[in-house]
Interface confidence: low
Amino acid sequence: MVPPPENVRMNSVNFKNILQWESPAFAKGNLTFTAQYLSYRIFQDKCMNTTLTECDFSSLSKYGDHTLRVRAEFADEHSDWVNITFCPVDDTIIGPPGMQVEVLADSLHMRFLAPKIENEYETWTMKNVYNSWTYNVQYWKNGTDEKFQITPQYDFEVLRNLEPWTTYCVQVRGFLPDRNKAGEWSEPVCEQTTHDETVPS
């Protein structure tokens, strides 16, 4: 009897959907695996007789529930199928956006870049999929614990009237208000303001 794959799960970030599993202990030899998806009430092969412990399902429609399954095989024997269901638009993890930060005197000018979807056009981003897409921005004075959050209306934001010659750190994440779903924060970007541009009278 061939034991089934273990710890079967979907690792999906920005619609890069990788079905992953672990090979069970099996004394007779090396196992291979077959992973399938349900299409029109028929299961179709996606990865056949692979020695890998993952299978890329990034081409799945983003909308709707999908049934995926994987089994282990050895010679003419095989394990039972292990099934999971997955809805990309609901279940994918929203990865961190990109961010460009520029210091202009006592202001930080930020531009946000929605995460790309790897298996689509170069210009395709998560904003193309989620109509309610917005950004959360978090910023703080470097070395302090107090953080401030804002929700920009656009793909850019300016933090004005900051303390001169002070280092501020900024990070951004995607947020879907209609789903109350937040993405992963970007790595903090820390920049030092320069002088206050106001001219004395």
């Epitope: 429609s61 909308y63 709707g64 298996n119």
Partner: nanobody, 125 residues
Framework: QVQLQESGGGSVQAGGSLRLSCAAS????????MGWFRQASGKEREGVAT???????RYADSVKGRFTISKDNAKNTLYLQMNSLKPEDTAMYYC???????????????????WGQGTQVTVSS
């Protein structure tokens, strides 16, 4: 739930024309890619044409210059005008919709979320 209902199929002589329609309802998102696929007897389903929410279109090489995809947003209806029909165009034609912009992979039916029931087109020589 998105529902798609095709109409307009039928039998026609080679060189003739047909216009397929697809009435759509139940959208929960404002942006959809829509398209037409077809499946001839004993063959795999193949992409024919797609139209994005912004109106940009794409066609399979085999139908370029003969078929025109369009949509009427006010009526929530998708159309496929098929001219200069050939016997090899004989197939069941399906209306399809998927979320957001049309990806190049729309031509693989694996990637499409919503389907109509299909309408038969038969072209005789």
């Amino acid at each position: 739930q998105v529902q798609l209902q095709e109409s307009g199929g039928g039998s026609v002589q080679a060189g003739g024309s047909l216009r397929l329609s697809c009435a759509a309802s139940g959208y929960t998102y404002s942006s959809y890619c829509m398209g037409w696929f077809r499946q001839a007897s004993g063959k795999e389903r193949e992409g024919v044409a797609t139209i994005d929410s912004d109106g940009s279109t794409r066609y399979a090489d085999s139908v370029k210059g003969r078929f025109t995809i369009s949509k009427d947003n006010a009526k929530n209806t998708l159309y496929l005008q098929m001219n200069s029909l050939k016997p090899e165009d004989t197939a069941m034609y399906y209306c399809a919709a998927d979320l957001a912009d049309c990806a190049p992979s729309i031509y693989s039916d694996y990637d499409v979320a919503h389907w109509g029931q299909g309408t038969q087109v038969t072209v005789s020589s």
